[in-house]
Interface confidence: medium
Amino acid sequence: MSQTKMLKVRVTLFCILAGIVLAMTAVVTDHWAVLSPHMEHHNTTCEAAHFGLWRICTKRIPMDDSKTCGPITLPGEKNCSYFRHFNPGESSEIFEFTTQKEYSISAAAIAIFSLGFIILGSLCVLLSLGKKRDYLLRPASMFYAFAGLCILVSVEVMRQSVKRMIDSEDTVWIEYYYSWSFACACAAFILLFLGGLALLLFSLPRMPRNPWESCMDAEPEH
């Protein structure tokens, strides 16, 4: 592989590494969305919530005379509970509301697939760099692109989950905004998917320059 190509691959791998860090951050944190209630009459506090793939946290925030609750960064009593994805016998009612269990299960499962693809891609990259097997960059690039797509699907599933929670008359939450974990997931998708495609392009053998050349005549990769 030429020096120019190697530099391009390294820059791409750096972008992919950033995507991996962002994907991991998004998966393990629970600030995908922040939900605020609207109440016609309320006590001195209100209950805002933020949630991720694995758990939901409600926070009791002091409320002023207005109808708004928050921001969630205000100090308050926090209470978190994990979604019971893998305990079908247990009740899915958390904090007096029924979670959109099927949505969070789907998003979490797809996120696990994404992490699986990231691990496979990283193994291919490590083997490629260690033993100069440049051809392993091609499956690695595909794995990263698939990981990115999985993150995108997780993002969309979570969007639907938030929409359904807000539209539901069975929660007190009526307003929402997407938070930093969601932004991390979106950025991870862009970096992993585009990085995967770029890595695939850079790791392909040079195309023949002349009509009489075949792929076999192209320069060796190492």
Epitope: P37, M39, E40, H42, E47, R60, F95, E96, D170, V172
Partner: antibody, heavy 125, light 110 residues
Framework: EVQLLESGGGLVQPGGSLRLSCAAS????????MSWVRQGPGKGLEWVSS????????FYADSVKGRFTISRDNSKNTLYLQMNSLRAEDTAVYYC??????????????????WGQGTTVTVSS | QSVLTQPPSASGTPGQRVTISCSGS????????IYWYQRLPGTTPKLLIY???QRPSGVPDRFSGSKSGTSASLAISGLRSEDEADYYC???????????FGTGTKVTVL
Amino acid sequence: EVQLLESGGGLVQPGGSLRLSCAASGFTFNNYGMSWVRQGPGKGLEWVSSISGSGGTTFYADSVKGRFTISRDNSKNTLYLQMNSLRAEDTAVYYCGKGGYCSSSGCRHYGMDVWGQGTTVTVSS
Amino acid sequence: QSVLTQPPSASGTPGQRVTISCSGSSSNIGNNYIYWYQRLPGTTPKLLIYRNNQRPSGVPDRFSGSKSGTSASLAISGLRSEDEADYYCAAWDDTLSGYVFGTGTKVTVL
């Protein structure tokens, strides 16, 4: 199917008392605010009283404050309206209504998305 | 006396668009959601619009709600004979700490 069924209406003399009941089914009763609304003969709808899901917060219209008491028994899925010192102007069809979802902080709203069929209260001597 | 003011009557021919207004103050409509109820003759009231402009399932899209400042309106497009009923607006009132209904509007299909 969400259903509300009122009972306890009837003819009562001025100054008398009456207790209305509203049996709820088809939803998790203690998670929702509940209200009583009435409609007098030839009149429009008038809100009477509301109660939060836990029963800890109650609201009354000025016209019934001090005379009417709203309560609920979540174990029986039943809403009550105790009416004392009844007056002729309390003559109306009384409806119970299911309000919005409640959390420990308050209720989403007390707007009635489901109504009962109504029970008639006549105050006359 | 009702805190929310509605016109006593409104009418239109089949297919026409009819609008019912509801006027209040900052303590009710201005700061809270508006609800619209339909009362067909001889029946119990039915929720028509909630949260200013949301329709419950089963309510035709001919009915639409809107809110601006301290007033709200309900529009019925493509008026039908079965729309002949009493219509009430309602909102929570922060000052009264209670629910307030409008005076009611009788819609007649000519």
